[in-house]
């Protein structure tokens, strides 16, 4: 099996996880995408998904999770707002492609949420310039009930669909060791 890699994100309660999942534009632009949590020894559980077919840059909100699919850029934006300690866990983005199994987008995300220090600047929701306001019009999409048992134990083989070259001038070395940096407040 392909070795699964993870990005680790260490945040404090009340902060926002704001990450992207890249996908191959031509192949998956309108496919339904989902955000899943993987608990030890269990199959992935879908927490939120886009509509089917996925609508361009149309926010879908499920509780504190907001998904936005930017078709023109091959980018799914995932936000988890007002994080709680119990949100800690292993997450992944997948693309639904029935009748085939979901396609996992590398890498998985290991989220560690710890108690915040009260009064710490920048640790709460109002410390940003509009960036984490929940969109006024959001849709809750119905997610397929099935999940893939295979994604619990192994990832699909890496292909050019999963990793492509940088879009511009910085030629990142050690692609497998690329820095893992979240964007959050």
């Amino acid at each position: 099996a392909t070795k699964l890699t993870e990005e680790k994100y260490e945040l404090k309660e009340g902060q926002t996880l704001d990450v992207k999942c890249d996908y191959t534009l031509e192949k998956f632009a309108s496919s339904q995408k989902a955000w899943q949590i993987i608990r030890d020894g269990e199959m992935p559980k879908t927490l939120a998904c886009t509509e089917r077919p996925s609508k361009n840059s149309h926010p879908v909100q499920v509780g504190r999770i907001i998904l936005e699919d930017y078709h023109d850029h091959g980018l799914l934006r995932v936000r988890m707002v007002n994080l709680q300690v119990e949100d800690s866990g292993l997450y992944q983005c997948v693309i639904y492609q029935p009748p085939k199994e979901p396609h996992m987008l590398f890498d998985r995300i290991r989220l560690v949420v710890t108690k915040g220090f009260s009064g710490t600047p920048g640790s709460n929701e109002n410390s940003t310039q509009n960036v984490y306001k929940i969109p006024p019009t959001t849709t809750k999409a119905l997610c397929p009930l099935y999940t893939s048992p295979r994604t619990v134990t192994q990832a699909p083989p890496k292909s050019t669909a999963d990793v492509s070259t940088p879009d511009s001038e910085i030629n990142l070395t050690n692609v497998t060791d690329i820095i893992r940096v979240p964007v959050f407040n």
């Epitope: 990005e7 680790k8 260490e10 945040l11 902060q15 704001d18 990450v19 992207k20 999942c21 890249d22 840059s57 930017y70 850029h73 091959g74 980018l75 934006r77 590398f106 890498d107 995300i109 920048g122 410390s127 940003t128 310039q129 509009n130 960036v131 306001k133 999963d162 990793v163 492509s164 070259t165 940088p166 879009d167 511009s168 001038e169 910085i170 990142l172 692609v175 497998t176 060791d177 690329i178 820095i179 893992r180 940096v181 979240p182 964007v183 959050f184 407040n185």
Partner: antibody, heavy 126, light 107 residues
Framework: QVQLVQSGAEVKKPGSSVKVSCKAS????????ISWVRQAPGQGLEWMGG????????DSAQKFQGRVTITADESTSTAYMELNSLRSEDTAVYYC???????????????????WGQGTTVTVSS | DIQMTQSPTSLSASVGDRVTITCRAS??????LAWYQQKPEKAPKSLIY???SLQSGVPSRFSGSGSGTDFTLTISSLQPEDFATYYC?????????FGGGTKVEIK
Amino acid sequence: QVQLVQSGAEVKKPGSSVKVSCKASGGTFSSSAISWVRQAPGQGLEWMGGIIPIFGTADSAQKFQGRVTITADESTSTAYMELNSLRSEDTAVYYCAFTPRYRGSSHHYFYALGVWGQGTTVTVSS
Amino acid sequence: DIQMTQSPTSLSASVGDRVTITCRASQGISSWLAWYQQKPEKAPKSLIYAASSLQSGVPSRFSGSGSGTDFTLTISSLQPEDFATYYCQQFNSYPLTFGGGTKVEIK
């Protein structure tokens, strides 16, 4: 190779506003990330905020909130930083910095401020 | 905000010397650290990202190490063009914060 060209030097009165532009060429602008960093004379670097143009909204350091507005125009691949209620301590060189989007294998937007503009000197003096 | 403390604030060295600059974060930042070089009247230049990955085009005499709270930038053999000010920056959380800088001067 991405290049960033910033607007020219400005001299402003206290209490006024300044808007600095940063035009990108040669790269994917919309889904990349733009940061604004300033440097007061003889001082270190200070991150003011950043924006991913396709998202339309920006994040800024708490110190500048209420005074700074960061925007981006995808059609012209130009980012802007407007600072209001200027005071003498805002005298500094203002840089824009570009983080190209890396497709695949990573989930973040900012990983390093890889390409920098030439800087715009803003002098605030009565 | 995460505070980044660099040491020393300045150092004098000769061409060929091995130079080490340290950067300490006020809380754990995993490996989310970058190093920059800045020369007088110039914009900063990216040297290292992810604590230890060399930016494309940067000479291999530059290396970075560390994780958590303690990080190091090493120049294995100082060259004349390396005399400059060096900054670390954390990318773990907003606001992205810089260290105060280390000025490397000619002895």
